[in-house]
C-alpha cells in the first residue's frame, strides 16, 4: 500500500522548516492547538529501562477532548557506543529527568504545557500530512539501516509501560537519514485505536490509519537522550502506518503473540531477537520528513520525523490483538493512545519523491 499523492507538483513555498524552540519559551497554544473532539490524545514514549519510583498508582483514565495522557515519563537512558560485551548492555540508565514531568495523563489535568512548557511549542507532532503540499526534496536519499537483523539470543525486553507497548533495542542498530546524519535506534513502540476506531498519530489528508509504529533513534552526536532533547536533529523517529491486510504479518506476530503476557500495566517479558527492519515498510526510498517533537511530555522539539509512504499490512486479527489486549492505569484498557494532530505553523513537510 502507498499513500496517495493527490497532485504531482504542488510544493508549498516559503515557511519555516521548523527551527528549534528553546524549552519554556514557546507560544501558548492557540485555539487550533487544541485537538478535535474525535482525536483522543496520545504519547511519545521516551526510551527507558524502568518506571520512575513511586509512580505505579496512577489515576483512572477519563476520556476527555484535551490532549493530555495518563502516563508516566520513563527514565531517560544513557546511550553509549558499544563497549565491552562482558558488561550487560542496553540502552537504558536510571536518570530521572524531573519531577514535574513525571505525572501526566490522558484526558485530564494537568494540562500538558503545565507539565512541560515545550508541549505548547509551535513545532509539535504529530501532524496531518498533505502529500500534495509536500515539497519534493531530491536530497532526501533512501534511508540506510544497518544491524537491524538480530539473532534470537540475547532476548529483548517487551514492556507494557501503561501507555504503549515498547521493545527496547540493543546497541548496534544504526540508521542514516543521509550523509552525516547518523543515528542509533533505542526503542520502538506502537500507537493504536480501539475496536473499529483507528489510532495512528500522524494522519494523511485527515485520514487516520489503524495504527502506527515508531522507532526512536538518538543522533550519534550525542551520548545521552537528555543531551539530545530539544536539540535540532538530536532525536529521529521512523514512523510507519499499519493497515489491515488479508494475511498475518509474521514479523509483527513475534511481538503480538506475546502481548497477553504483558496485559497488565508495568509488566514485561523477554522476546527472541528478530529482524527489526521487517517491522517497517520495505521501501526506504519514499517518505515524508519534517521537524517536530515528541508527542508526549516533555514534547521536546527538534525531532526529525520520517514517515514512510508505504504502509505495513497486518491482519484484522492482529490489529484487534494490538488494540484489545493491554491494560493501562486505573483498570482502563490501553487504547486510543495517540495525540491529536498539531498545526504546522509554517513548517513545510518534505517528500523524498516527486
Amino acid at each position: 500500500q502507498r499513500l496517495p499523492r493527490m497532485q504531482e507538483d504542488s510544493p508549498l513555498g516559503g515557511g519555516s522548516s521548523g527551527e528549534d524552540d528553546p524549552l519554556g519559551e514557546e507560544d501558548l497554544p492557540s485555539e487550533e492547538d487544541s485537538p478535535r473532539e474525535e482525536d483522543p490524545p496520545g504519547e511519545e514514549d521516551l526510551p527507558g529501562e524502568e518506571d520512575l519510583p513511586g509512580e505505579e498508582d496512577l489515576p483512572e483514565v477519563k476520556p476527555k477532548s484535551e490532549e493530555e495522557g495518563s502516563l508516566k515519563l520513563e527514565d531517560l537512558p544513557t546511550v553509549e557506543a558499544p563497549g565491552d560485551p562482558q558488561e550487560p548492555q542496553n540502552n537504558a540508565h536510571r536518570d530521572k529527568e524531573g519531577d514535574d514531568q513525571s505525572h501526566w495523563r490522558y484526558g485530564g489535568d494537568p494540562p500538558w504545557p503545565r507539565v512541560s512548557p515545550a508541549c505548547a511549542g509551535r513545532f509539535q507532532s504529530p501532524v496531518d500530512i498533505r502529500p500534495q503540499l509536500a515539497a519534493f526534496c531530491p536530497a532526501l536519499r533512501p534511508l540506510e539501516l544497518l544491524g537491524f537483523q538480530l539473532p534470537p539470543l540475547p532476548e529483548l525486553r517487551l514492556r507494557n509501560n501503561g501507555h504503549s507497548v515498547q521493545l527496547t533495542l540493543p546497541p548496534g542498530l544504526e540508521m542514516a537519514l543521509g550523509p552525516g546524519r547518523e543515528y542509533r535506534a533505542l526503542q520502538l513502540h506502537l500507537h493504536w485505536g480501539a475496536a473499529g476506531r483507528p489510532g495512528s498519530e500522524h494522519t494523511v489528508e485527515g485520514h487516520r490509519f489503524p495504527a502506527e509504529i515508531h522507532v526512536v533513534h538518538l543522533s550519534t552526536a550525542f551520548a545521552r537522550v537528555d543531551e539530545a532533547l530539544g536539540r535540532p536533529g538530536g532525536l529521529a523517529v521512523l514512523a510507519a502506518f499499519l493497515e489491515e491486510g488479508p494475511e498475518e504479518n509474521s514479523a509483527y506476530e513475534q511481538l503480538l503473540s506475546r502481548l497477553e503476557e504483558i496485559a497488565e500495566e508495568g509488566s514485561e517479558t523477554q522476546v527472541p531477537g528478530l529482524d527489526i527492519s521487517a517491522l517497517l515498510p520495505s521501501d526506504f526510498s519514499r517518505y515524508f520528513q519534517y521537524e517536530g517533537s515528541l508527542t508526549t511530555p516533555p514534547c521536546a522539539q527538534g525531532v526529525i520525523w520520517t514517515v514512510f509512504n508505504q504502509t505495513v499490512m497486518l491482519s484484522a486479527k492482529q490489529l484487534h490483538t494490538l488494540s484489545d489486549t493491554l491494560w493501562g492505569p486505573g483498570d482502563s484498557r490501553l487504547q486510543l493512545n495517540f495525540r491529536a494532530t498539531q498545526p504546522l505553523n509554517g513548517r513545510v513537510i518534505e517528500a523524498s519523491f516527486p
Epitope: 558499544p82 560485551p85 562482558q86 558488561e87 550487560p88 548492555q89 542496553n90 544497518l146 544491524g147 537491524f148 537483523q149 538480530l150 539473532p151 534470537p152 539470543l153 540475547p154 532476548e155 540493543p170 546497541p171 548496534g172 523477554q270 527472541p272 531477537g273 529482524d275 527492519s277
Partner: antibody
C-alpha cells in the same frame, strides 16, 4: 573474576549418557543467554545448543536435536547439557559460553571439557 | 563443511599485515547478521577478538580490526607478532538453519 568452570566430561560408550555442568561466577548469570559449543578433534568450532536467560527458550543444532537437552539453574548459577544416545561423532571438547549482551557474540568461555564416545 | 568459509591458513612475516576472509550467504552474513571473530589457541578457551563486525572488546590490541561487506567479512592483523600465531574463527547466525554458525577456522603462521 568473571569465569565459567566446567565439569562432567569423560569417556562413554555409544548410546550412553553424560551430563556436563558449567558453573558461572563474577557476572549476573541470570541475565545472560548461554550456549554450548564443541570442537571435534582436528575440526572447527560447532555451536551445539543455547538457552535464554530465564531458561524459557532453548535452541539446538540439527545434529543433536532430540538427543541433547540444555537447561539452567539460575539459583545455582549453573548451566547444564544432558547428552543422551551419544555417538562417536559427538566426541569433542565441549565449551560453555556466555551469549553476551551484544547480538550473539560468545564473550565468556569455559575452559572446555573432553567428551569421548568410544566402545 | 562449515557454513562460513575461511581459508585454512594464512602467513606473514613479523610486522606485516595479514587478512582472513569469511564468506557466508544471504541467510547469514548477507542477511545482515553480525560477524564476530575469535582467537583460539588449541587446548584453551576461545577468546572473543572482534564483535559486531568491527568492535574490539577491552584488552584486545588495536592491531586487530574487522569489517563486513555484503556476504563476507574479514579480519585484519597489522604489525603481525609471534604471539598471533594461532587459530582464528569467524561466527554469525544463520536464519535458514536457525543456528549460530562458525567458519572452519584459519591458522595464522608467523614466518
Amino acid at each position: 573474576q568473571v569465569q565459567l568452570v566446567q565439569s562432567g566430561g569423560g569417556v562413554v560408550q555409544p548410546g550412553g549418557s553424560l551430563r556436563l555442568s558449567c558453573a558461572a561466577s563474577g557476572f549476573p548469570f541470570s541475565s545472560y543467554a548461554m550456549s554450548w559449543v564443541r570442537q571435534a578433534p582436528g575440526k572447527g568450532l560447532e555451536w551445539v545448543s543455547a538457552i535464554s536467560a530465564n531458561g524459557g527458550t532453548t535452541y539446538y543444532a540439527d545434529s543433536v536435536k532430540g538427543r541433547f537437552t540444555i537447561s539452567r539453574d539460575n539459583s545455582k548459577n549453573t548451566l547444564y547439557l544432558q547428552m543422551n544416545s551419544l555417538r562417536a561423532e559427538d566426541t569433542a571438547v565441549y565449551y560453555c559460553a556466555n551469549n553476551g549482551n551484544y547480538r550473539g557474540a560468545f564473550d565468556i568461555w569455559g575452559q572446555g571439557t573432553m567428551v569421548t564416545v568410544s566402545s | 563443511q562449515s557454513v562460513l568459509t575461511q581459508p585454512p591458513s594464512v602467513s606473514g612475516a613479523p610486522g606485516q599485515r595479514v587478512t582472513i576472509s569469511c564468506t557466508g550467504s544471504s541467510s547469514n552474513i548477507g542477511a545482515g547478521y553480525d560477524v564476530h571473530w575469535y582467537q583460539h589457541l588449541p587446548g584453551t578457551a576461545p577468546k572473543l577478538l572482534i564483535y559486531g563486525n568491527s568492535n574490539r572488546p577491552s584488552g584486545v590490541p588495536d592491531r586487530f580490526s574487522g569489517s563486513k561487506s555484503g556476504t563476507s567479512a574479514s579480519l585484519a592483523i597489522t604489525g603481525l607478532q609471534a604471539e598471533d600465531e594461532t587459530d582464528y574463527f569467524c561466527q554469525s547466525y544463520d536464519s535458514s538453519l536457525s543456528a549460530w554458525v562458525f567458519g572452519g577456522g584459519t591458522k595464522v603462521t608467523v614466518l
